[in-house]
Amino acid sequence: LSVQQGPNLLQVRQGSQATLVCQVDQATAWERLRVKWTKDGAILCQPYITNGSLSLGVCGPQGRLSWQAPSHLTLQLDPVSLNHSGAYVCWAAVEIPELEEAEGNITRLFVDPDDPTQNRNRIASFPG
């Protein structure tokens, strides 16, 4: 089982949308695939795919999941808020016929405030 995640870095403006893609491949067929998206180590969602369909379409706040055969799992965040900034990781495991798991590399999402002055204030608030 192979998982490739992209992009490595994603910078978007608050209120727009962000798309994270996870490509899941296996040489042999699978009956059930468990997938998981995490943000900063916390689980956003953990649905499974069987018969070509996701068991869940929602993934975290303002997150929508979709599966496009043969191998693309997409997490779409819309609209993006400042709280969406963080490190996202896609994980997958074939549950049937036999257990095999893999995870992607981190996608770092940076959300720029719609009002540029918020960014200055935020930077100014850091200690030191």
Epitope: S2, A27, T28, A29, W30, G52, P97, E100
Partner: antibody, heavy 120, light 113 residues
């Protein structure tokens, strides 16, 4: 350019153990998402898949031969090794190694094969 | 194990004429999850290792002449050669990678009349 080359004894006596080595050049067997396979073909007969080993070290064997087979890899030498115990004349065949990727699943690269004869 | 059955086992063809090989599997090789058929075709020329012709039932491998085509889904598959050439001589195998153990058909020997 990826090349696979099988090596091992050409003649084995019945009941002995066969050890075959597949040396991979131009590509690291530690690369994620790849399976390294052994396939054999008795003279004039069909191809028969024997075993595979995945990047993670997970192995899978043909159930009909599972008790006799062991597949391992030596990453320091970039080699995949197959051992087959209790050899019999019916095991006389050309033995091939071949790679297979998660992206696709077909046998993309094959070695030239090595003929192993089992005879006393 | 999935059993792969090829017909015919021998196929004499006149150069320039078409040729067709059938492959049937004992269970479906189509996945509803990936929308793929886990079926490949190989040609083993005399004295050589097998070489990939068609993958996922209908996709021509890189460098394979367009006279070769694959079709079918589920349990029934076909390899067609639109105009046979002398260099096409050899044994053709279908192979499933839907599940392990990976299995091959018995092979179809194509020869020139």
């Amino acid at each position: 350019q990826i090349t696979l080359k099988e090596s091992g004894p050409t003649l084995v006596k019945p009941t002995q153990t066969l050890t075959l080595t597949c040396t991979v050049s131009g590509f690291s067997i530690t690369t994620g998402g790849y399976y390294w396979n052994w396939i054999r073909q008795p003279p004039g007969k069909k191809l028969e898949w024997l075993a595979l080993i995945y990047t993670s070290g997970r192995t899978s064997y043909n159930p009909s031969l599972k008790s006799r087979l062991t597949i391992t890899k030596d990453t320091s030498k970039n080699q995949v090794v197959l051992t087959m115990t209790n050899m019999d004349p019916v095991d006389t065949a050309t033995y091939y190694c071949a790679d297979m990727a998660d992206k696709g699943g077909w046998f993309a690269y094959w070695g030239q094969g090595t003929l192993v004869t089992v005879s006393s | 194990d999935i059993v792969m059955t090829q017909t015919p086992l021998s196929l004499p063809v006149t150069p320039g004429e078409p040729a067709s090989i059938s492959c049937r599997s004992s269970q479906s090789l189509f996945s509803s999850n990936t929308k793929r058929n886990y079926l490949d075709w190989y040609l083993q020329k005399p004295g050589q290792s097998p070489q990939l012709l068609i993958y996922h039932a209908s996709y021509r491998a890189s460098g394979v002449p367009d006279r070769f085509s694959g079709s079918g889904s589920g349990t029934d598959f076909t390899l067609k050669i639109s105009r046979v050439e002398a260099e096409d001589v050899g044994v053709y195998y279908c192979q499933q990678h839907y599940e392990t153990p990976l299995t091959f058909g018995q092979g179809t020997r194509l020869e020139i009349k």
